[in-house]
């Protein structure tokens, strides 16, 4: 069955997928799709690479790692509950039926906010979940707290940076990896 990964609403979700190129720069096409891997290709493609570059992507979906070294892990920006589901990472190795397919289950949960002890102003109305997030580790809490002169975009960016660094560290070692060549 699928490996399950979790994120909270407003975070950037990270779905790990790796392969080892036969030689540096000798890349293999990869596709990411929403939905379980079909017999061929990816359904509902959200991102695709070819032998040289990322040649197709949709908003909020990107590769954060070095895909030229085989890190084709998918980052989904600013997730909502509707981003939950099965995602397919398909490494399209040349030859008949040689593709490696990985189904990853992404479960998004409502974000949990610890009330900041100091004044919060009114930006909680637009981003009620952005001020404080509870992390994935045991008893881990990351607090942005009182931010007197900062706009919503900065709050969102700062929150995502905190989350991304944590998620990448937490999940990088648990991803699907194959060696080619």
């Amino acid at each position: 069955s699928e490996v399950e990964y979790r994120a909270e609403v407003g975070q950037n979700a990270y779905l790990p997928c790796f392969y080892t190129p036969a030689a540096p720069g000798n890349l293999v096409p990869v596709c990411w799709g929403k939905g379980a891997c079909p017999v061929f290709e990816c359904g509902n493609v959200v991102l695709r690479t070819d032998e040289r570059d990322v040649n197709y992507w949709t908003s909020r979906y990107w590769l954060n790692g070095d895909f030229r070294k085989g890190d084709v892990s998918l980052t989904i920006e600013n997730v909502t509950l509707a981003d939950s589901g099965i995602y397919c990472c398909r490494i399209q190795i040349p030859g008949i039926m040689n593709d490696e397919k990985f189904n990853l289950k992404l479960v998004i949960k409502p974000a949990k906010v610890t009330p900041a002890p100091t004044r919060q102003r009114d930006f909680t109305a637009a981003f009620p979940r952005m001020l404080t997030t509870r992390g994935h580790g045991p008893a881990e809490t990351q607090t942005l707290g009182s931010l007197p002169d900062i706009n919503l975009t900065q709050i969102s960016t700062l929150a995502n940076e905190l989350r991304d660094s944590r998620l990448a560290n937490d999940l990088r070692d648990s991803g699907a990896t194959i060696r080619i060549g």
């Epitope: 909502t80 509707a82 939950s84």
Partner: antibody
Framework: QGQLQQPGAEVVKPGAAVKLSCKAS????????MQWIKQRPGQGLEWIGE????????DYNQNFKGKATLTVDTSSSTAYLQLSSLTSEDSAVYYC????????????WGPGTLVTVSS | DILMTQSPSSMSVSLGDTVSIICHAS??????IGWLQQKPGKSFKGLIY???NLEDGVPSRFSGSGSGADYSLTISSLESEDFADYYC?????????FGGGTKLEIK
């Protein structure tokens, strides 16, 4: 998918409080958030709030803050909605609903409890 | 709060018909929408989640579509058990908010 059981009806006096129960069975209670919803005839549906049974974390509709309190008892796999200072406006059917496997918040519903506030 | 405007409020249809119910959100809700069914005097059943996905056990004659702020529930080849009230609900933002409902009646 499991089941959610709620008592059929509660009659309470104005000014009193009532604690409504929603007993879960057939699934892992602490794995899924629970929602509470109010339905009044001709008034549509109102979301009251949600609770994560794994750690008692709650989110409330601001319109129900001070009126509603959500709790859980994991030992009996039961979620509770307490309503305080009841008035005739609180007479309604109250439903619990739990999320589904892919974070669908309103996947499975209890049968609802009819609360009647009457002296 | 996000306002969910559902239409029509009621419709009379015949067995075997195909019907669509529309929900318009007051802002982009990014497919964070569910569709619910309530039979007279009964509780609710989840039909569709995340805009297009069928809840477990829901017949394939139900389907959901849409994006941005506009979504629809379509029921093809109506059966007698489909005559009920239908509601949409958004969950992209707090508080969760519901449409006003659509009553499907037999013509």
């Amino acid at each position: 998918q499991g089941q959610l059981q709620q008592p059929g009806a509660e009659v309470v006096k104005p000014g009193a409080a009532v604690k409504l129960s929603c007993k879960a069975s057939g699934y892992t209670f602490t794995s899924y958030w629970m929602q509470w919803i109010k339905q009044r005839p001709g008034q549509g549906l109102e979301w009251i709030g949600e609770i994560d049974p794994s750690d008692n974390y709650t989110d409330y509709n601001q319109n129900f803050k001070g009126k509603a309190t959500l709790t859980v008892d994991t030992s009996s796999s039961t979620a509770y909605l307490q309503l305080s200072s009841l008035t005739s406006e609180d007479s309604a059917v109250y439903y619990c609903a739990r999320e589904g496997a892919f974070s669908s918040p309103f996947a499975y519903w209890g049968p609802g409890t009819l609360v009647t506030v009457s002296s | 709060d996000i306002l969910m405007t559902q239409s029509p409020s009621s419709m009379s249809v015949s067995l075997g018909d195909t019907v669509s119910i529309i929900c318009h959100a007051s802002q982009d809700i990014r497919s964070n929408i569910g569709w619910l069914q309530q039979k007279p005097g009964k509780s609710f059943k989840g039909l569709i989640y995340h805009g297009t996905n069928l809840e477990d056990g829901v017949p394939s004659r139900f389907s959901g579509s849409g994006s941005g702020a506009d979504y629809s529930l379509t029921i093809s080849s109506l059966e007698s058990e489909d005559f009920a009230d239908y509601y949409c609900v958004q969950y992209v933002q707090f508080p969760r908010t519901f449409g006003g409902g659509t009553k499907l009646e037999i013509k």
